[in-house]
């Protein structure tokens, strides 16, 4: 803290504000009758330099002039940008114990003259907004710099406003608080910015603009949509706009979409008809405005209007499939399955399905509605039956889809040939086939049907299927395909009134099974041994099992075991072997093999045949 300079004065030449790189002379003078109490020659004036209140230098060696005991002049050089404090102190040399006494101080500011302001940009937000201009000030001056924004225009009028930059605040924008109205649309305005500080001044180049150049309309507001006669595809978008708007841009998209539909509307006056909307779809609408067809700026986009278009009656055809199971000699169970319509076909919330089973000749009709995507009925085994299903929402129903109920695998001549299933990757299987060789009626379509080979899958889970045109001989199946699971795949060839099928198993990825089959019993019948087993639990199969192996060897023998390989059939759980010696104790075990390899061995069982050897 500097005492109020009672003892003397400090002056700076050429000035307390200097350009970067300049030197300054600081003179410290004692007032008359001030100083050390004994004699003037003992007065020693010292100059201390502080930056950010921290003493950084004693300038004792920088004296350039000295009136002993009265005044001293110090030269300071290499001052850094910003403010530096210099304090002059009096040191009475005969008294070493007393600290130097402050005389006076001075602050020197080092900076640069302002550069001409550049990139002036003015904006008025909305017809009732006010003009605000911003600019680039250029390099920091490190000095208090005043900026004057001056706007000249019609009516011989000039408007100006000032602000300043220093080490605490920056001035590069000013709002003039004045509104330009549409009656000035043809008028030209000139804006310039002048910067002044203690080291100089500079002016921007004049920047000319018109009302249309700078007025950015407010975004439209109060957006709403009216659907004509509750139409799901046609609607009138309405909004409020500023009075002078002549051009609007509309953008809209379904909520899950990534690209906007764009529309330009001239002189829309807050209303526009849209004709290509998708029914029962969540849409987002936004609008932007412009005051002039060719010039001017677009407003920001309005806030979004989010709404769902109304429903319309479903279109499209349901994809139907079925299963037939004979119950007894005169009854069969028909299970119908169908896939949900996709949203663009459903065009609303599907409330129910209308299902019809009709016996063609006797004209017997069974009708029902269901909310599910399957329906099961028991019907007589006699007669020709046809099924139809349609989907209904609040606005109506789709056209019914018909399918003839035939014996799906009844005609051997219609069975596709050379069916194969190859794993393509983790979640799909490529199924290929050849057409039936001697079909006596034309194939109308192929159906590829698949389901996981797990216990109860026929009753618990509906099938998955794909419809394939008659000239295609392959299908890539991926719906509900998981790795390490074996699927039964059927390829059906359907004519108008008959069906033939071929079956194969396939998986999308496989590993060797986790364990081998468990031998449950070994029995001897007519000089043959029957090995019985339980299948490997479904999760441990890890793909399609191609075959089982039964191994046997004499107990305590070190020889390689013998083996018998059995083609895997799900229905089979026993197999005979007949090459064992009587009254010799054998050890038997089983393994399972997938395309990836062989499982570890299952449990071991010992057995000693009693009968004659073959």
């Amino acid at each position: 803290n500097i005492d109020v300079c009672k003892l003397g004065t400090v002056t700076v030449q050429p000035a307390p504000v200097i350009p970067l790189g300049s030197a300054a002379n600081i003179s410290c003078s004692l007032n008359p009758k001030q100083g050390c109490s004994h004699y003037p020659s003992s007065n020693e004036l010292i100059l201390l330099k502080f930056v950010n209140d921290v003493l950084v230098e004693n300038l004792h060696g920088k004296k350039v002039h000295d009136h002993t005991g009265h005044s001293s002049t110090f030269q300071v050089t290499n001052l850094s940008l910003g403010m530096t404090l210099f304090v002059c102190k009096l040191n009475c040399s005969n008294s070493q114990k007393k600290p130097p006494v402050p005389v006076c101080g001075v602050e020197i500011s080092v900076g640069v003259a302002p550069e001409p302001p550049q990139n002036i940009s003015c904006v008025q937000e909305g017809e009732n907004g006010t003009v605000a201009c911003s600019w680039n000030s250029g390099k920091v001056t490190y000095l208090k710099t005043n900026y004057t924004l001056q706007l000249s225009g019609p009516n011989n009028l000039t408007c100006q406003k000032q602000c300043f930059s220093d080490n605490r605040q920056n001035c590069n924008r000013l709002d003039l608080g004045i509104n330009l109205s549409p009656d000035l649309a043809e008028s030209r305005f000139i804006v310039r910015v002048t910067a002044i500080n203690d080291l100089g001044n500079s002016s921007s180049l004049p920047h000319t603009f018109t009302f249309l150049d700078i007025v950015i309309p407010l975004p439209p507001w109060d957006i709403r949509i009216n659907f004509l006669n509750a139409s799901g595809s046609r609607g009138t978008l309405q909004w409020e706009d500023e009075g002078q708007v002549v051009l609007n841009q509309l953008r809209y998209q379904p909520l899950n979409s990534t690209s906007w539909n764009m529309v330009n509307a001239t002189n829309a006056k807050g209303k526009y008809d849209l004709r290509d909307l998708r029914p029962f779809t969540e849409y987002e609408f936004q609008i932007s405005s412009k005051l002039h067809l060719s010039g001017g700026s677009w407003s920001n986009w309005s806030e979004s209007l989010r709404t769902r278009t109304p429903e319309e009656e479903p279109v499209g055809i349901l994809d139907i499939w079925y299963m037939k199971q004979d119950i007894d000699y005169d009854r069969q169970q028909i299970s119908l399955f169908w896939k949900s319509l996709n949203p663009s076909e459903a065009r609303g919330k599907i409330l129910h399905y209308q299902v019809t089973l009709q016996e063609v000749t006797k004209k017997t009709t069974l009708q029902n509605t269901t909310r599910h995507t399957s329906w099961t009925r028991v019907i007589p085994r006699t007669g020709a039956w046809t099924a139809s299903v349609s989907a209904a929402n609040s606005k109506g129903a789709s056209a019914p889809t018909h399918i003839n109920i035939v014996d799906l695998c009844g005609t051997g001549l219609l069975a596709p040939h050379q069916v194969s299933a190859k794993s393509e990757n983790m979640d799909n299987i490529l199924v290929t086939w050849q057409p039936p060789k001697k079909a006596d009626s034309a194939v109308r379509e192929y159906i590829v049907e698949w389901r996981a080979l797990q216990p109860g899958s026929i009753t618990k889970f509906p099938p998955h299927w794909l419809r394939i045109p008659p000239d295609n001989m392959s299908a890539l199946i991926s719906e509900n395909i998981k790795p390490y699971i074996c699927y039964e795949i059927r390829v059906h060839a359907l004519s108008e009134s008959q069906g033939g099928c071929s079956s194969i198993r396939g998986d999308s990825k496989h590993k060797a099974p986790v364990s081998g089959p468990h031998i449950t019993a070994i029995t001897e019948k007519k000089e043959r041994l029957f090995i019985s087993w339980t299948h490997i639990p479904f999760p441990e199969q890890r793909g399609c099992i191609l075959h089982y192996r039964i191994y046997w060897k004499e107990r305590d023998s070190t020889a390689q075991p013998e083996l018998c390989e059995i083609q895997y059939r799900r229905s089979q759980n026993s197999h005979p072997i007949s090459s064992l010696q009587p009254r010799v104790t054998y050890v038997l075990w089983m393994t399972a093999v997938t395309a990836a390899g062989e499982s570890p061995q299952g449990n071991e069982r010992e057995f000693c045949p009693q009968g004659k050897a073959n």
Partner: nanobody, 127 residues
Framework: QVQLQESGGGLVQAGGSLRLSCAAS????????IGWFRQAPGKEREFVAA????????FFTDSVKDRFSISRDNAKNTVLLQMNSLKPEDTAVYYC????????????????????WGQGTQVTVSS
């Protein structure tokens, strides 16, 4: 009641200076634009300068923009018009007026847009 009172007019030689003051009573200048107009004998009232109290912006007609300045004294609720380098053609009665928002460029110079007026103060510049 709302009143505006001008003061500071007088006789001055060409090249001299005068400082006019406009004091408000009955209301504060808070959101107003305060304008100075002048009327020479036989001529229409013309706009001279104005100050937007809230925005801090100043306005001048081209003939005075390099000679006159306008400022405010918040504490005294007054607006000051400093007139330098006066010319004989500056001779007129000077009126202070106050205008409500909105503050439009087109309206600043129009006397009809100003709701409140003072009585005026005479400024005479002799050659």
């Amino acid at each position: 009641q709302v009143q505006l009172q001008e003061s500071g007019g007088g006789l001055v030689q060409a090249g001299g200076s005068l400082r006019l003051s406009c004091a408000a009573s009955g209301f504060t200048f808070d959101d107003y634009t305060i304008g100075w107009f002048r009327q020479a004998p036989g001529k229409e009232r013309e706009f001279v300068a104005a100050l937007s109290w809230s925005a801090g912006s100043t306005f001048f007609t081209d003939s005075v923009k390099d000679r006159f300045s306008i400022s405010r004294d918040n504490a005294k609720n007054t607006v000051l018009l400093q007139m330098n380098s006066l010319k004989p053609e500056d001779t007129a009665v000077y009126y202070c007026a106050a205008k409500n928002p909105p503050h439009r460029w087109s309206d600043i110079t129009k006397s009809l847009q100003y709701a409140y007026w003072g009585q005026g103060t005479q400024v005479t510049v002799s050659s």
